[in-house]
Amino acid sequence: MAPWPELGDAQPNPDKYLEGAAGQQPTAPDKSKETNKTDNTEAPVTKIELLPSYSTATLIDEPTEVDDPWNLPTLQDSGIKWSERDTKGKILCFFQGIGRLILLLGFLYFFVCSLDILSSAFQLVGGKMAGQFFSNSSIMSNPLLGLVIGVLVTVLVQSSSTSTSIVVSMVSSSLLTVRAAIPIIMGANIGTSITNTIVALMQVGDRSEFRRAFAGATVHDFFNWLSVLVLLPVEVATHYLEIITQLIVESFHFKNGEDAPDLLKVITKPFTKLIVQLDKKVISQIAMNDEKAKNKSLVKIWCKTFTNKTQINVTVPSTANCTSPSLCWTDGIQNWTMKNVTYKENIAKCQHIFVNFHLPDLAVGTILLILSLLVLCGCLIMIVKILGSVLKGQVATVIKKTINTDFPFPFAWLTGYLAILVGAGMTFIVQSSSVFTSALTPLIGIGVITIERAYPLTLGSNIGTTTTAILAALASPGNALRSSLQIALCHFFFNISGILLWYPIPFTRLPIRMAKGLGNISAKYRWFAVFYLIIFFFLIPLTVFGLSLAGWRVLVGVGVPVVFIIILVLCLRLLQSRCPRVLPKKLQNWNFLPLWMRSLKPWDAVVSKFTGCFQMRCCCCCRVCCRACCLLCDCPKCCRCSKCCEDLEEAQEGQDVPVKAPETFDNITISREAQGEVPASDSKTECTAL
């Protein structure tokens, strides 16, 4: 149950620490220089100095020859300098630059399109199931169930706007109260952060790149989880979100507004609608207990239809079921009444690939899921490659300085808030926090943006997506305006509250430290990234869902001991790192626990054995497949022929290099094992030949 620390020999030393501003970290040397580092697992470990946890940027002063894996890499420019080129070379270089820019924009376009298709694929695979989650009556009384339903539905449909719109329609139809909807919205906020975490997994080929990318993506997850952890109990106790938003909605006389501008969709829709088009109303109908919707396909077949309102005669069990007494009659045997029906006449079929295949939703979804992940991965690799070739030397320095440097004193604190505004603005433009954070992930991976800077951008993205929802709410029809606006405002104030909790004071920026901790673990044990994804986005929500269905007694009976153990472990961990002398000798470290409970090494052995069968089979496969293989089996030799996972990793496998790392990983999340034994970076873990 405990984290995996092996900290018997760690001694606190409050005198030795460095304070560094976010984004002003020294840059690490060239990757190529790191390859000659040796590794000896049995070597004595450099003592790690533990520090008071009051700044996110506090680093441990380690031997100077060791590099911090969180330092941004220097992307060396190996090409000929501009001044040394002749006219022909300059023209060629210029056109190469233009070509790269076009390619970059092209791959970025297909990257965004593949995210859209990925969302459609998830909806086809799990949309109906997601809709059924909503039809659970216990949501009304159990906020925890509402929360996990929000997570699961958003993960299943890969779109917080879809799950939010279902909630809005349920509130408008009085199937759900605003009070019951708030935890679902919180859950949707968590669920939407899975997309960029999936994108981060695509950068698994390079350990140091993966460390940064995964941490950069999961900073969003941790922010959302921590916000919920604090704000859900507060909301349940005080209903502050409900009260504030109700006051706002009631004090303003809103007129129906215009629809939120679809800026990115305008560009991507022409392509994505050729792949697949979905009838998203089906999920909402299932959520609202429409039995007929359960048999409907999500794949849109008819795009042009004519709706004709007509009256038809229908039989009813008795005259009491008649529309009105005057519209009631009998044929002598059965009672009849007149019903208004909307008759839909199909005029023109949609023009997408799957329109004439008549495949089940699951089949279409699976095909699209595989294809979109492949395209997503391929585009990401190409984006990283192009950015890697563009962002070298001076260009990289300028960009990195522009993005990561703070304003001059005394306005340095304003930089982060500007980043929040930028994140919000960018998200408002692209109309999707998933797209924005997913685009940010590879930039964090290749070292253009620091996690410290990505954090406020991500927080801004969370705000941006709620402003879009507010605009969409203002464009709602009269009956849905109040409920949709109140829910959109709840979403907005929840994110504002989260920012107030986890951003203004550097000490409270826990998500950064937790994400870096997870990044370190995942860089060492890459399977842990998938494990984290499954646990946090599927298993925990599904377990809570299952326990909630069993009844609140079962939920409390299981939940309370689990929460108690977690708190106990955290308290013990804190005491071990701050004042171990208070504790009995046995409890001063985790050595009293069996190895499997305090280290990932035994688990790694199990995973390696389990994935061993994949190791030999994935040779000579395409680069994308190889990356997936490397992610699954963490194999150093498996893809030698495609040069994807270099033999170089063999040399780094057993390294034990002490690193300079933010002190709180050691205090809270992460062991020496994950910290110290992770190589600073990989050299060439990407395929050289595409």
Epitope: N313, T319, P325, S326, L327, C328, W329, T330, D331, G332, I333, Q334, N335, W336
Partner: antibody, heavy 119, light 107 residues
Framework: QVQLVQSGAEVKKPGASVKVSCKTS????????MHWVRQAPGQGLEWIGA????????AYNQKFKGRVTMTADTSTSTVYMELSSLRSEDTAVYYC????????????WGQGTLVTVSS | DIQMTQSPSFLSASVGDRVTITCKAS??????VAWYQQKPGKSPKLLIY???TRHSGVPDRFSGSGSGTEFIFTISSVQPEDFATYFC?????????FGAGTKLEIK
């Protein structure tokens, strides 16, 4: 064209039963209800009940409940109406009539069967 | 049961006259009313259903109107073949009931 041909006149003693048949043609037998209406000499029309040949479902006027039985034979497209415990006031012309689909108006009628009840 | 009160019971008219027959329902029947024509020794014949809709093959001199509880049957210009007995019928609820009839005679 739609045709409804009823069985011939019947003379019955009080307490006896009578079974009148109505053979249909010219339409799909199982789609429309078949009504039975009687008319006492010099009197108005009185609805006895109806049968839906498609399922055999029936509905009877409360006045005749327990005394009337309606059946349908889909193989011969014929409906039958049996009235038991006959009384002298049951003397009337009995008509079968096809109900229009979806409502209780009767568009085609049989020629009628005179049932006389006398001792 | 719903009572259908038809008036008048007897009606004398000449060829070319406009005649109206009234039928009153004891409760609201909407428009679930039909009108029939019966000649002596013959079966009834459907003329109007849904209070206003003419059955196929019925001349347009026959028309119906009304809803709720009051219904009117009109022959705009009586023809020699129109002299017969006319019945109204409600099919709003079971049992189906008929009016007592109106006998149209030659004046």
């Amino acid at each position: 064209q739609v045709q409804l041909v009823q069985s011939g006149a019947e003379v019955k003693k009080p307490g006896a039963s009578v079974k009148v048949s109505c053979k249909t043609s010219g339409y799909t037998f199982t789609t429309n209800n078949m009504h039975w209406v009687r008319q006492a000499p010099g009197q108005g029309l009185e609805w006895i009940g109806a049968i839906y040949p498609g399922s055999g479902a029936t509905a009877y006027n409360q006045k005749f409940k327990g005394r009337v039985t309606m059946t349908a034979d889909t193989s011969t497209s014929t409906v039958y109406m049996e009235l038991s415990s006959l009384r002298s006031e049951d003397t009337a012309v009995y008509y079968c009539a096809r109900g229009m689909y979806g409502h209780g108006a009767m568009d085609y009628w049989g020629q009628g069967t005179l049932v006389t009840v006398s001792s | 049961d719903i009572q259908m009160t038809q008036s008048p019971s007897f009606l004398s008219a000449s060829v070319g006259d406009r005649v109206t027959i009234t039928c009153k329902a004891s409760q609201d029947v909407g428009t679930a009313v039909a009108w029939y024509q019966q000649k002596p020794g013959k079966s009834p014949k459907l003329l109007i259903y849904w209070a206003t809709t003419r059955h196929s093959g019925v001349p347009d001199r026959f028309s119906g109107s009304g809803s709720g509880t009051e219904f009117i049957f009109t022959i705009s210009s009586v023809q020699p073949e129109d002299f017969a007995t006319y019945f109204c019928q409600q099919y709003s609820s079971n049992p189906l009931t008929f009016g007592a009839g109106t006998k149209l005679e030659i004046k």
